[in-house]
């Protein structure tokens, strides 16, 4: 019967006793940077071309016995997971292997850098179709390795990497921490994070999504027909590389940003038990398990958005945190979050010709996160409209006044340390959805966008008594672009988007002992693009 991992990534409409997805990734070439491989294994023979690239360090220890099958074990298994004819994800994809890990699975940053350069030169000399580069390795944070990944990604190559098996924040490792790379954590048959001895999958904001990574059956280098079970984030990354190859084969013109958004969109949501992660990492770690799209075509009409968390600002009084979208994405809204609740809000600002989301720490605060909502919105023209703190008691307001511009997000930012704790919340007058409102002490920022066929609406959910969490979701066919809290409650820790749901978090009322701080209202801005829907109908 079908291995559990292949069943897990297969949408229900394709499920059968055998894994037979509609497109095998035949237009895509996958580069594997790993150990040597046994290319004559019948699972991968004819599918994997072993390049002459080799850059590995000496094995440790004078008594190390170099056994071919052990040297090839990791790479052979991963090649099988990506494109194996029996237990592979993208059965039609062709692969090229580069040896950057020795027989003990060790490599160097310089070896990997030279490997990436080898791929870049190969691409220049003989341009082929879409390229996916699988980096099933993780080492300490390396600015130079991350920069090399960025260069290759900007040349149009899709890089997929393992989050690492250290049960730690993936942002501390490279290439997992490179924003341009698709970073993959590992889950098991129960959709739980993979434990590996005393360690396990890495987690955190640098992980894009998870994928099957425990007891994964694949080609064994022991013999030509041997199969073996292996576990780890390398196996998880191999699944995503295979899914990416299939998506790119179906839609070869997809950009990295479009591919990442689709991977996120088609993932299984909220199936991972977050209790496995350290408490401070739960909100930052995406609860997504990779899956193939239900159809490899026709997703173009959707407005895709994802949430990008910044690094932590640190606790200093004037500390700020910045969240950025990828080059091809539009920043449609900006929010902030602080576990202590002490923050001075957030704002969208231009940096290097692109909007970024900046969050501000407050005096006595333990630090803040900036949360960007990054979307694919072709032909968009977005700008930020700011209203300085108002003198009137009605509070600060700002709206999108340009013809054809719609409100996609609201942010507020204040200079004062204490934002009038006991003032009642300002209520938005009904019938004016195209404006942001806030405290009179705060400056308010409206993200206003014009794009063909773009329409947005505001959705609110208020709870009269304080609650730790208030949510509001966009309905089917609409995409969450903005998430904020109505002003007036000092116990709000911040707001952030989780998939298509706006989450407003408040301080635990039981610990503050006060219930007089009023209602909490979560405000979602939900958008859709009629233009994208019409464009896709014309294509079919």
């Amino acid at each position: 019967s079908i291995p559990w991992n292949l069943e897990r990534i297969t949408p229900p409409r394709y499920r059968a006793d055998e894994y037979q997805p509609p497109d095998g990734g035949s237009l895509v070439e996958v580069y594997l940077l790993d150990t040597s491989i046994q290319s004559d294994h019948r699972e991968i023979e004819g599918r994997v071309m072993v390049t002459d690239f080799e850059n590995v360090p000496e094995e440790d220890g004078t008594r190390f016995h170099r056994q071919a099958s052990k040297c090839d074990s990791h790479g052979t298994h991963l090649a099988g997971v990506v494109s194996g004819r029996d237990a592979g994800v993208a059965k039609g994809a062709s692969m090229r292997s580069l040896r950057v890990l020795n027989c003990q699975g060790k490599g160097t940053v310089s070896g990997t850098l030279i490997g990436l350069e080898f791929i870049r030169k190969s691409q220049l000399v003989q341009p082929v179709g879409p390229l996916v580069v699988l980096l099933p390795l993780a080492g300490g944070y390396s600015r130079v390795l991350n920069a090399a990944c960025q260069r290759l990604a900007r040349a149009g190559v899709v890089l997929v990497t393992a989050a690492g098996n250290f049960r730690d924040d993936a942002c501390l490792y490279s290439p997992a921490s490179a924003p341009e790379v698709i970073t993959v954590g590992a889950t098991n048959a129960q959709d739980q994070p993979v434990t590996l001895g005393t360690l396990g999958t890495n987690f955190g904001r640098c992980v894009d999504l998870f994928a099957p990574g425990e007891d994964i059956i694949g080609a064994s280098s022991d013999c030509s027909t041997c199969f073996v079970s292996q576990s780890g984030t390398s196996q998880a990354a191999a699944h995503v590389a295979g899914i990416a190859a299939m998506m790119l084969s179906a839609e070869p013109e997809l950009t990295l940003a479009e591919l990442r958004q689709r991977l996120i969109h088609f993932s299984a949501k909220d199936v991972i038990n977050e209790a496995w992660f350290p408490e401070d990492q739960r909100v930052l770690t995406p609860n997504l398990v990779a899956a193939l799209p239900p159809s490899t075509h026709g997703a173009g009409w959707q407005l895709f958005c994802r949430t990008v968390w910044s690094a932590h600002s640190g606790p200093t009084r004037m500390a700020t945190a910045v969240a950025r979208c990828a080059p091809d994405e539009e920043l449609l809204s900006c929010s902030s979050f602080s576990r202590s609740g002490k923050r001075r809000g957030e704002r969208m600002e231009a940096q290097g010709g692109k909007l970024v989301c900046r969050a501000h720490n407050a005096f006595g605060g333990e630090g803040v996160y900036a949360i960007a909502r990054c979307c694919l919105l072709p032909q968009a023209n977005c700008s930020v409209h700011t209203a300085p703190p108002a003198e009137a008691s009605m509070g600060t307001r700002v709206h999108c006044h340009q013809q054809g511009h719609v409100l996609t997000g609201c942010s507020s930012h204040w200079e004062v340390e204490d934002l009038g704790t006991h003032k009642p919340p300002v209520l938005r007058p009904r019938g004016q959805p195209n404006q942001c409102v806030g405290h009179r002490e705060a400056s308010i920022h409206a993200s206003c966008c014009h794009a063909p066929g773009l329409e947005c609406k505001v959705k609110e959910h208020g709870i009269p008594a304080p609650q730790e969490q208030v949510t509001v979701a966009c309905e089917e066919g609409w995409t969450l672009t903005g998430c904020s809290a109505l002003p007036g409650t000092s116990h709000v820790l911040g707001a952030y988007a989780v998939d298509n749901t706006c989450v407003v978090r408040s301080r635990d009322v039981s610990t503050t002992g006060s219930t007089s701080e009023g209602a909490v209202t979560a405000v979602a801005i939900c958008c859709r693009s009629r233009h994208l829907a019409q464009a896709s109908q014309e294509l079919q």
Epitope: R42, R85, D86, C226
Partner: antibody
Framework: QVQLVQSGAEVKKPGESLKISCKGS????????IAWVRQMPGKGLEWMGI????????HYNPKFQGQVTISADKSISTAYLQWSSLKASDTAMYYC????????????WGQGTLVTVSS | DIVMTQSPDSLAVSLGERATINCRSS????????????LAWYQQKPGQPPKLLIY???TRESGVPDRFSGSGSGTDFTLTISSLQAEDVAVYYC?????????FGQGTKVEIK
């Protein structure tokens, strides 16, 4: 039920060409390998090669490489063994058999095709 | 190539008696990654195709009588028919299926004494 049905016996002259077939049914043909095995009169079994109909990957026993061609048409769940120029020494019973990645041994066999090459 | 050598070439056993066939491979077919021996046993009766009896050296195929058993590991293997029946008259082959080309033993003919 799962079965492999082979084409009928053939009598040929040396130098002639021949293509024998093996049709699978009762299982997902593209997800299993088909092997061809030769048995010369009164002799043992010799593995000739294998094909994966899903992508037409083949692997030959070096002894038979260049002597025969293994192919498949997945649309009709059929594998083939062919000769471009038969020799008297090709006289034998030829069996097809299937195997799977999780069971890489031959669990189902065809009934065999007897090929006789004589002038 | 892995060479498979069976012994004896032929064997005559009384009905109800034990028949033992040996098979030796020129290199180990036991693999550490999954701790399995990549060895199978087949039975071929006159005018019929081979039939799978045993795989992974000791796992009986469904429908095969329990008088057939396989044992051994690494390079030395044994097929045992605990109580020979008339219908067991056949040629028995061992096969290694780990490495290309896949190879068979030369066969052992089992007859009734």
């Amino acid at each position: 039920q799962v079965q492999l049905v082979q084409s009928g016996a053939e009598v040929k002259k040396p130098g002639e060409s021949l293509k024998i077939s093996c049709k699978g049914s009762g299982y997902s043909f593209t997800n299993y390998y088909i092997a061809w095995v030769r048995q010369m009169p009164g002799k043992g079994l010799e593995w000739m090669g294998i094909i994966y109909p899903g992508d037409s990957y083949t692997h030959y026993n070096p002894k038979f490489q260049g002597q025969v061609t293994i192919s498949a048409d997945k649309s009709i769940s059929t594998a083939y063994l062919q000769w471009s120029s038969l020799k008297a020494s090709d006289t034998a019973m030829y069996y097809c058999a299937r195997d799977h990645w999780s069971r890489p041994f031959s669990d189902v066999w065809g009934q065999g095709t007897l090929v006789t090459v004589s002038s | 190539d892995i060479v498979m050598t069976q012994s004896p070439d032929s064997l005559a056993v009384s009905l109800g008696e034990r028949a033992t066939i040996n098979c030796r491979s020129s290199q180990s077919v036991l693999y550490s990654s999954n701790n399995k021996n990549y060895l199978a046993w087949y039975q071929q009766k006159p005018g019929q195709p081979p039939k799978l009896l045993i795989y992974w050296a000791s796992t009986r195929e469904s429908g095969v009588p329990d008088r057939f058993s396989g044992s051994g590991s690494g390079t030395d293997f044994t097929l045992t028919i605990s109580s020979l029946q008339a219908e067991d008259v056949a040629v028995y082959y061992c096969q290694q299926y780990s490495s290309f080309p896949i190879t068979f033993g030369q066969g052992t003919k089992v007859e009734i004494k």
